[in-house]
């Protein structure tokens, strides 16, 4: 029995930041779980982990240097990635594992989300000029 995961097909990170919501066919309330976000077609880079335990505060961490935060819903985890680089444009996959209570459950591989990181504009656009000097 596998959990199903839904993700947006594509997101654009305009300010080098993005919210990626992973929606599950499973209620995480009062479960011990490990939700993770993986980068690349082969999911080789684990970008961020959200660990939840019915008796402890939510833990959010990255072992790979990403600036991430996480929010928990009953049937979703939202990853908030900041300080993304243009070269981190890639496909990102949500993964969920329920460790307790038994049995262990994980998800069918999702279709993933392409995150397109747009570079920051370092000078004002001609259409939106900055404030004029007095």
């Amino acid at each position: 029995n596998k959990i199903l995961v839904k993700q947006s097909p594509m997101l654009v990170a305009y300010d080098n930041a993005v919210n990626l919501s992973c929606k599950y066919s499973y209620n995480l309330f009062s479960r011990e779980f490990r939700a993770s976000l993986h980068k690349g077609l082969d999911s080789a880079v684990e970008v961020c982990v959200v660990y939840g335990n019915y008796s402890q505060q939510l833990q959010v961490y990255s072992k790979t240097g990403f600036n991430c935060d996480g929010k928990l819903g009953n049937e979703s985890v939202t990853f908030y990635l900041q300080n993304l680089y243009v070269n981190q444009t890639d496909i990102y996959f949500c993964k969920i594992e329920v460790m307790y209570p038994p049995p262990y459950l994980d998800n069918e591989k999702s279709n993933g989300t392409i995150i397109h990181v747009k570079g920051k504009h370092l000078c004002p656009s001609p259409l939106f000029p900055g404030p004029s000097k007095p």
Partner: antibody
């Protein structure tokens, strides 16, 4: 309290194989990785690999891939390491030790007493 | 694989001294470094996790610092019971790897 119980010693012949056991108690077996660590007499610690009892997922150091096979029996909360084609190089103490699977507390916090394997003809 | 180089390999110090042991990782491991103590004839015991966090029950004279590739274990006011071999271990990526160990002796 958390306990990882291992047999004290095994005396084996060269070429034989051995299955070491590690019985866990006092915690949720499926919330932790089980690792195996080798220590030859008077030497340092070498990480062999680990297994996640929930899914059976295993990770090995390349050096030990053809030597060690890790398995678990969740019904008895026991982890096993099978060592094949034993040589004198396999004479060592083998420890089982756990680390949390989900949280950022990612260190080996409880250790078994170790099984001393002696390979001798 | 990430290599972890530990120095010195042995160290002799007097009771009451402050000593430092260093570990250098071959690539950035952020804060994912742990320290273990192994007393003669005993099993390894976790001292510090995630570079600077003292494990439960470990005396406050032990401290850890560092991030990226350079890490330090400091023992202040050395006690007789601190005679042991100390190991660092990186947990940033698999395979996990240990430093070669530092054998601490009392002068």
């Amino acid at each position: 309290q958390v306990q990882l119980q291992q047999p004290g010693s095994e005396l084996m012949r060269p070429g034989a194989s051995v299955k070491l056991s590690c019985k866990a108690s006092g915690y949720t077996f499926t919330s932790y990785w089980m690792h195996w660590v080798k220590q030859r007499h008077g030497q340092g610690l070498e990480w062999i690999g680990n297994i996640y009892p929930g899914s059976g997922r295993t990770i090995y150091d390349e050096k030990f891939k053809s030597k060690a096979t890790l398995t678990v029996d969740t019904s008895s909360s026991t982890a096993y390491m099978h060592l094949s084609s034993l040589t004198s190089e396999d004479s060592a103490v083998f420890y089982c030790t756990r680390s949390h699977y989900g949280s950022s507390f990612d260190a080996m916090d409880y250790w078994g007493q170790g099984t001393s394997v002696t390979v001798s003809s | 694989d990430i290599q972890v180089n530990q120095s010195p390999s042995s160290l002799s110090a007097s009771l009451g001294d402050t000593i430092t042991i260093t570990c250098h990782a071959s690539q950035n491991i952020y804060v994912w470094l742990n320290w273990y103590q192994q007393k003669p004839g005993n099993i390894p015991k976790l001292l510090i996790y995630k570079a600077s966090n003292l494990h439960t029950g470990v005396p406050s004279r032990f401290s850890g610092s560092g991030s990226g590739t350079g890490f330090t274990l400091t023992i202040s006011s050395l006690q007789p019971e601190d005679i042991a071999t100390y190991y660092c271990q990186q947990g940033q990526s698999y395979p996990w790897t240990f430093g070669g160990g530092t054998k601490l002796e009392i002068k």
